[in-house]
Protein backbone atom coordinates (compact mmCIF):
# COMPACT_ATOMS: atom_id res chain seq x y z
CA UNK A 1 0.00 0.00 0.00
CA UNK A 2 1.30 3.44 -0.95
CA UNK A 3 1.13 5.67 2.11
CA UNK A 4 3.58 8.35 1.02
CA UNK A 5 2.99 11.87 -0.17
CA UNK A 6 5.03 14.00 -2.56
CA UNK A 7 5.48 17.56 -1.39
CA UNK A 8 6.70 20.03 -4.02
CA UNK A 9 7.57 23.69 -4.31
CA UNK A 10 4.20 24.07 -6.08
CA UNK A 11 3.79 27.15 -8.26
CA UNK A 12 7.00 29.15 -8.46
CA UNK A 13 8.28 32.11 -10.41
CA UNK A 14 11.79 33.20 -11.27
CA UNK A 15 13.58 35.85 -13.29
CA UNK A 16 14.61 35.35 -16.89
CA UNK A 17 18.36 34.72 -16.93
CA UNK A 18 18.28 33.62 -13.31
CA UNK A 19 18.11 30.18 -11.75
CA UNK A 20 15.55 28.17 -9.84
CA UNK A 21 15.57 25.08 -7.64
CA UNK A 22 13.05 22.38 -8.47
CA UNK A 23 12.47 20.32 -5.35
CA UNK A 24 10.22 17.43 -4.42
CA UNK A 25 10.13 15.63 -1.10
CA UNK A 26 8.65 12.23 -0.34
CA UNK A 27 7.17 11.96 3.14
CA UNK A 28 4.94 9.68 5.24
CA UNK A 29 6.58 6.49 4.02
CA UNK A 30 9.56 4.35 4.96
CA UNK A 31 10.00 3.29 1.32
CA UNK A 32 13.51 3.44 -0.11
CA UNK A 33 13.93 5.88 -3.01
CA UNK A 34 15.74 4.04 -5.79
CA UNK A 35 15.46 6.64 -8.55
CA UNK A 36 14.07 10.11 -9.19
CA UNK A 37 13.30 11.27 -12.73
CA UNK A 38 12.83 14.92 -13.63
CA UNK A 39 10.78 15.72 -16.73
CA UNK A 40 9.74 18.91 -18.48
CA UNK A 41 6.25 20.05 -19.57
CA UNK A 42 6.31 17.99 -22.78
CA UNK A 43 7.44 14.96 -20.73
CA UNK A 44 10.95 15.19 -22.14
CA UNK A 45 13.67 14.06 -19.74
CA UNK A 46 15.74 16.62 -17.86
CA UNK A 47 17.63 14.39 -15.46
CA UNK A 48 17.71 11.12 -13.53
CA UNK A 49 19.11 10.61 -10.07
CA UNK A 50 19.70 6.92 -9.38
CA UNK A 51 20.55 6.00 -5.80
CA UNK A 52 23.37 3.67 -6.91
CA UNK A 53 24.57 5.14 -10.20
CA UNK A 54 24.32 8.84 -9.43
CA UNK A 55 23.12 11.52 -11.83
CA UNK A 56 22.32 11.43 -15.52
CA UNK A 57 21.69 14.85 -17.03
CA UNK A 58 20.09 14.98 -20.47
CA UNK A 59 23.00 16.06 -22.71
CA UNK A 60 21.30 19.08 -24.27
CA UNK A 61 20.68 20.52 -20.78
CA UNK A 62 24.07 19.69 -19.28
CA UNK A 63 25.30 23.27 -19.52
CA UNK A 64 22.35 24.73 -17.60
CA UNK A 65 21.02 21.98 -15.35
CA UNK A 66 22.91 21.37 -12.13
CA UNK A 67 22.29 18.31 -9.95
CA UNK A 68 20.88 18.97 -6.51
CA UNK A 69 20.46 20.12 -3.88
CA UNK A 70 19.68 16.60 -2.72
CA UNK A 71 17.32 14.88 -5.12
CA UNK A 72 16.29 18.24 -6.56
CA UNK A 73 17.47 20.04 -9.65
CA UNK A 74 18.78 23.54 -10.29
CA UNK A 75 17.74 25.05 -13.60
CA UNK A 76 20.02 27.92 -14.66
CA UNK A 77 20.06 30.65 -17.34
CA UNK A 78 16.28 30.62 -17.47
CA UNK A 79 14.46 31.59 -20.66
CA UNK A 80 10.80 32.32 -21.23
CA UNK A 81 10.54 28.90 -22.88
CA UNK A 82 11.24 27.28 -19.51
CA UNK A 83 7.79 28.37 -18.32
CA UNK A 84 5.56 25.35 -17.77
CA UNK A 85 5.07 22.17 -15.80
CA UNK A 86 7.85 20.04 -14.33
CA UNK A 87 7.38 16.57 -12.93
CA UNK A 88 9.35 14.54 -10.42
CA UNK A 89 8.82 10.79 -10.51
CA UNK A 90 10.00 8.83 -7.48
CA UNK A 91 10.62 5.12 -7.94
CA UNK A 92 10.56 3.52 -4.51
CA UNK A 93 10.81 0.11 -2.93
CA UNK A 94 8.50 -1.43 -1.92
CA UNK A 95 5.83 1.22 -2.53
CA UNK A 96 6.23 1.80 -6.26
CA UNK A 97 6.01 5.10 -8.12
CA UNK A 98 5.05 8.55 -6.80
CA UNK A 99 4.73 11.66 -8.96
CA UNK A 100 4.83 15.34 -8.15
CA UNK A 101 4.15 18.48 -10.20
CA UNK A 102 5.70 21.94 -10.13
CA UNK A 103 4.62 24.90 -12.26
CA UNK A 104 7.38 27.36 -13.12
CA UNK A 105 6.67 30.80 -14.48
CA UNK A 106 9.66 32.67 -15.89
CA UNK A 107 9.15 36.43 -15.70
CA UNK A 108 10.77 39.29 -17.58
CA UNK A 109 10.06 41.57 -14.66
CA UNK A 110 12.79 42.34 -12.13
CA UNK A 111 10.25 41.87 -9.35
CA UNK A 112 10.05 38.12 -10.04
CA UNK A 113 10.48 36.25 -6.83
CA UNK A 114 11.39 32.62 -6.42
CA UNK A 115 8.93 31.17 -3.93
CA UNK A 116 10.56 28.37 -1.97
CA UNK A 117 7.58 27.26 0.07
CA UNK A 118 6.57 23.61 -0.09
CA UNK A 119 3.04 22.55 -0.78
CA UNK A 120 1.17 19.33 -1.43
CA UNK A 121 -0.10 19.28 -5.02
Amino acid sequence: MMTGTIETTGNISAKKGGSVILQCHLSSTMAQVTQVNWEQHDHSLLAIRNAELGWHIYPAFKDRVAPGPGLGLTLQSLTMNDTGEYFCTYHTYPDGTYRGRIFLEVLESSVAEHSARFQIP
Partner: antibody
Protein backbone atom coordinates in the same frame (compact mmCIF):
# COMPACT_ATOMS: atom_id res chain seq x y z
CA UNK B 1 29.54 11.15 -36.83
CA UNK B 2 30.09 9.86 -33.30
CA UNK B 3 33.30 7.83 -33.05
CA UNK B 4 35.04 6.16 -30.13
CA UNK B 5 38.51 4.97 -31.07
CA UNK B 6 40.32 2.74 -28.59
CA UNK B 7 44.00 1.95 -28.12
CA UNK B 8 45.55 -1.23 -29.45
CA UNK B 9 45.79 -4.75 -28.04
CA UNK B 10 47.88 -5.35 -24.92
CA UNK B 11 49.63 -8.40 -23.50
CA UNK B 12 50.37 -8.21 -19.79
CA UNK B 13 51.85 -10.40 -17.09
CA UNK B 14 49.84 -11.34 -13.97
CA UNK B 15 50.11 -8.64 -11.32
CA UNK B 16 50.74 -5.87 -13.84
CA UNK B 17 48.42 -2.98 -14.76
CA UNK B 18 46.91 -1.96 -18.06
CA UNK B 19 45.60 1.41 -19.19
CA UNK B 20 43.22 1.53 -22.16
CA UNK B 21 42.34 4.78 -23.91
CA UNK B 22 39.21 5.83 -25.78
CA UNK B 23 39.30 8.95 -27.96
CA UNK B 24 35.90 10.47 -28.63
CA UNK B 25 34.94 12.63 -31.61
CA UNK B 26 31.82 13.85 -33.38
CA UNK B 27 30.06 15.19 -30.27
CA UNK B 28 30.61 17.38 -27.21
CA UNK B 29 32.71 15.11 -25.00
CA UNK B 30 31.75 16.70 -21.67
CA UNK B 31 28.00 16.40 -22.30
CA UNK B 32 27.90 12.60 -22.29
CA UNK B 33 28.91 10.17 -19.57
CA UNK B 34 31.25 7.34 -20.57
CA UNK B 35 31.04 3.68 -19.56
CA UNK B 36 33.54 0.83 -19.62
CA UNK B 37 32.35 -2.72 -20.27
CA UNK B 38 34.36 -5.89 -20.77
CA UNK B 39 33.70 -9.24 -22.41
CA UNK B 40 35.75 -12.32 -21.59
CA UNK B 41 35.90 -15.01 -24.30
CA UNK B 42 32.48 -16.64 -24.71
CA UNK B 43 31.07 -14.69 -21.75
CA UNK B 44 28.37 -12.09 -21.27
CA UNK B 45 29.17 -8.41 -21.18
CA UNK B 46 30.27 -7.09 -17.78
CA UNK B 47 29.89 -3.45 -16.74
CA UNK B 48 32.89 -1.93 -14.95
CA UNK B 49 31.94 1.69 -14.30
CA UNK B 50 31.01 5.12 -15.65
CA UNK B 51 32.41 8.63 -15.50
CA UNK B 52 31.08 12.15 -15.99
CA UNK B 53 33.74 13.77 -18.21
CA UNK B 54 32.59 17.21 -17.11
CA UNK B 55 33.10 16.75 -13.36
CA UNK B 56 35.36 13.68 -13.34
CA UNK B 57 32.96 11.97 -10.93
CA UNK B 58 32.78 8.21 -11.35
CA UNK B 59 30.82 5.17 -10.20
CA UNK B 60 32.22 1.64 -10.22
CA UNK B 61 30.99 -1.92 -10.15
CA UNK B 62 31.82 -3.12 -6.62
CA UNK B 63 33.50 -6.18 -8.15
CA UNK B 64 36.22 -3.97 -9.69
CA UNK B 65 36.21 -1.06 -7.27
CA UNK B 66 39.59 -1.77 -5.67
CA UNK B 67 41.33 -2.38 -9.02
CA UNK B 68 39.81 -0.07 -11.62
CA UNK B 69 40.25 3.67 -12.17
CA UNK B 70 38.37 5.57 -14.86
CA UNK B 71 39.64 9.02 -15.79
CA UNK B 72 39.28 11.56 -18.59
CA UNK B 73 41.38 14.19 -20.32
CA UNK B 74 38.93 16.87 -21.41
CA UNK B 75 41.44 18.66 -23.64
CA UNK B 76 41.95 15.60 -25.84
CA UNK B 77 38.38 14.22 -25.40
CA UNK B 78 39.83 10.95 -24.20
CA UNK B 79 38.62 8.54 -21.53
CA UNK B 80 40.90 6.04 -19.80
CA UNK B 81 40.35 2.82 -17.92
CA UNK B 82 43.18 1.45 -15.80
CA UNK B 83 42.94 -2.03 -14.30
CA UNK B 84 45.58 -3.14 -11.80
CA UNK B 85 46.67 -6.45 -10.24
CA UNK B 86 45.84 -8.28 -13.44
CA UNK B 87 45.06 -11.99 -13.39
CA UNK B 88 44.34 -14.48 -16.16
CA UNK B 89 40.56 -14.03 -15.68
CA UNK B 90 40.98 -10.39 -16.78
CA UNK B 91 41.74 -11.57 -20.31
CA UNK B 92 38.92 -9.94 -22.26
CA UNK B 93 37.89 -7.36 -24.81
CA UNK B 94 37.43 -3.99 -23.10
CA UNK B 95 34.95 -1.49 -24.55
CA UNK B 96 34.28 2.17 -23.89
CA UNK B 97 30.69 3.13 -24.56
CA UNK B 98 28.95 6.49 -24.53
CA UNK B 99 25.92 6.85 -22.28
CA UNK B 100 22.64 7.43 -24.11
CA UNK B 101 20.45 10.53 -24.03
CA UNK B 102 17.75 9.12 -21.78
CA UNK B 103 19.50 7.06 -19.13
CA UNK B 104 22.25 4.68 -18.16
CA UNK B 105 22.34 2.50 -21.30
CA UNK B 106 25.05 2.94 -23.98
CA UNK B 107 24.30 4.24 -27.46
CA UNK B 108 27.75 4.18 -29.13
CA UNK B 109 30.59 1.72 -28.52
CA UNK B 110 34.30 1.73 -29.24
CA UNK B 111 35.80 -1.03 -31.39
CA UNK B 112 37.17 -2.82 -28.32
CA UNK B 113 40.67 -3.42 -26.97
CA UNK B 114 41.88 -6.98 -26.41
CA UNK B 115 43.83 -7.40 -23.19
CA UNK B 116 45.58 -10.73 -22.71
CA UNK B 117 46.98 -11.63 -19.31
CA UNK B 118 49.51 -14.44 -19.52
CA UNK B 119 52.71 -15.44 -17.78
CA UNK C 1 23.04 -7.62 -8.08
CA UNK C 2 20.11 -7.73 -10.49
CA UNK C 3 20.22 -11.05 -12.33
CA UNK C 4 19.29 -11.19 -16.01
CA UNK C 5 18.27 -14.41 -17.72
CA UNK C 6 17.44 -14.90 -21.40
CA UNK C 7 15.53 -17.54 -23.29
CA UNK C 8 16.10 -19.34 -25.48
CA UNK C 9 19.90 -19.71 -25.48
CA UNK C 10 19.73 -19.92 -29.26
CA UNK C 11 17.14 -20.09 -31.99
CA UNK C 12 17.06 -20.72 -35.73
CA UNK C 13 14.37 -18.97 -37.75
CA UNK C 14 13.57 -19.02 -41.46
CA UNK C 15 14.16 -15.83 -43.44
CA UNK C 16 11.10 -13.61 -43.26
CA UNK C 17 9.77 -15.35 -40.14
CA UNK C 18 9.35 -13.90 -36.65
CA UNK C 19 12.03 -14.28 -33.94
CA UNK C 20 11.18 -13.71 -30.28
CA UNK C 21 13.71 -13.39 -27.47
CA UNK C 22 12.75 -13.17 -23.81
CA UNK C 23 14.55 -11.52 -20.93
CA UNK C 24 13.63 -12.07 -17.29
CA UNK C 25 14.92 -9.87 -14.51
CA UNK C 26 15.29 -10.82 -10.84
CA UNK C 27 13.54 -7.66 -9.59
CA UNK C 28 11.33 -4.85 -10.82
CA UNK C 29 13.24 -2.53 -13.13
CA UNK C 30 10.15 -0.70 -14.44
CA UNK C 31 10.96 -0.07 -18.13
CA UNK C 32 14.71 0.46 -17.75
CA UNK C 33 15.84 -2.25 -20.14
CA UNK C 34 18.01 -2.08 -23.25
CA UNK C 35 18.64 -4.58 -26.05
CA UNK C 36 21.91 -4.87 -27.97
CA UNK C 37 22.94 -6.77 -31.08
CA UNK C 38 26.47 -8.13 -31.40
CA UNK C 39 27.75 -9.67 -34.59
CA UNK C 40 30.89 -11.87 -34.57
CA UNK C 41 34.04 -9.80 -34.12
CA UNK C 42 32.08 -6.57 -33.69
CA UNK C 43 31.11 -4.25 -30.85
CA UNK C 44 27.58 -4.33 -29.44
CA UNK C 45 25.03 -2.11 -31.16
CA UNK C 46 22.11 -0.51 -29.31
CA UNK C 47 18.71 -1.58 -30.64
CA UNK C 48 16.19 -0.61 -27.95
CA UNK C 49 16.22 1.37 -24.70
CA UNK C 50 13.55 2.05 -22.07
CA UNK C 51 12.12 -1.38 -23.01
CA UNK C 52 10.38 -0.25 -26.17
CA UNK C 53 12.05 2.81 -27.70
CA UNK C 54 13.91 2.00 -30.91
CA UNK C 55 17.39 3.50 -31.17
CA UNK C 56 18.19 5.83 -34.03
CA UNK C 57 18.66 4.07 -37.36
CA UNK C 58 17.35 0.69 -36.19
CA UNK C 59 14.95 -0.96 -38.69
CA UNK C 60 11.33 -1.09 -37.55
CA UNK C 61 11.23 -4.88 -37.85
CA UNK C 62 12.80 -4.76 -34.37
CA UNK C 63 10.51 -4.02 -31.44
CA UNK C 64 10.71 -4.25 -27.67
CA UNK C 65 8.01 -4.76 -25.09
CA UNK C 66 7.49 -5.52 -21.42
CA UNK C 67 7.93 -3.86 -18.05
CA UNK C 68 8.70 -4.88 -14.48
CA UNK C 69 10.51 -8.20 -14.72
CA UNK C 70 9.55 -9.66 -18.12
CA UNK C 71 10.68 -8.26 -21.46
CA UNK C 72 10.67 -9.31 -25.10
CA UNK C 73 12.62 -8.40 -28.22
CA UNK C 74 10.85 -9.28 -31.46
CA UNK C 75 12.24 -9.35 -34.99
CA UNK C 76 9.09 -9.39 -37.09
CA UNK C 77 10.68 -10.61 -40.32
CA UNK C 78 14.17 -12.05 -39.93
CA UNK C 79 16.79 -10.88 -42.43
CA UNK C 80 20.17 -12.46 -43.15
CA UNK C 81 21.94 -9.48 -41.55
CA UNK C 82 20.12 -10.13 -38.25
CA UNK C 83 22.26 -13.19 -37.51
CA UNK C 84 23.94 -12.19 -34.23
CA UNK C 85 23.90 -12.57 -30.47
CA UNK C 86 21.31 -10.41 -28.68
CA UNK C 87 21.82 -9.17 -25.12
CA UNK C 88 19.43 -7.51 -22.71
CA UNK C 89 20.72 -5.09 -20.08
CA UNK C 90 18.98 -3.29 -17.25
CA UNK C 91 19.83 0.39 -16.85
CA UNK C 92 18.46 0.89 -13.36
CA UNK C 93 21.12 0.28 -10.69
CA UNK C 94 24.72 -0.51 -9.83
CA UNK C 95 26.01 -2.74 -11.23
CA UNK C 96 24.44 -2.54 -14.64
CA UNK C 97 24.13 -6.18 -15.70
CA UNK C 98 23.60 -8.00 -18.98
CA UNK C 99 21.85 -11.20 -19.91
CA UNK C 100 23.88 -14.20 -21.14
CA UNK C 101 22.83 -13.59 -24.74
CA UNK C 102 20.63 -15.33 -27.30
CA UNK C 103 22.21 -16.52 -30.55
CA UNK C 104 19.98 -16.06 -33.60
CA UNK C 105 20.67 -18.05 -36.77
CA UNK C 106 18.96 -18.73 -40.08
CA UNK C 107 17.08 -22.02 -40.35
Amino acid sequence: EVQLVQSGAEVKKPGASVKVSCKASGYTFTNYYMHWVRQAPGQRLEWMGRIDPDSGGSKYNEKFKSRVTITVDKLSSTAYMELSSLRSEDTAVYYCAREGHYGFYSDYWGQGTTVTVSS
Amino acid sequence: DIVMTQSPDSLAVSLGERATINCRVSENIYSYLAWYQQKPGQSPKLLVYNAKTLAEGVPDRFSGSGSGTDFTLTISSLQAEDVAVYYCQHHYGNPLTFGPGTKVDIK
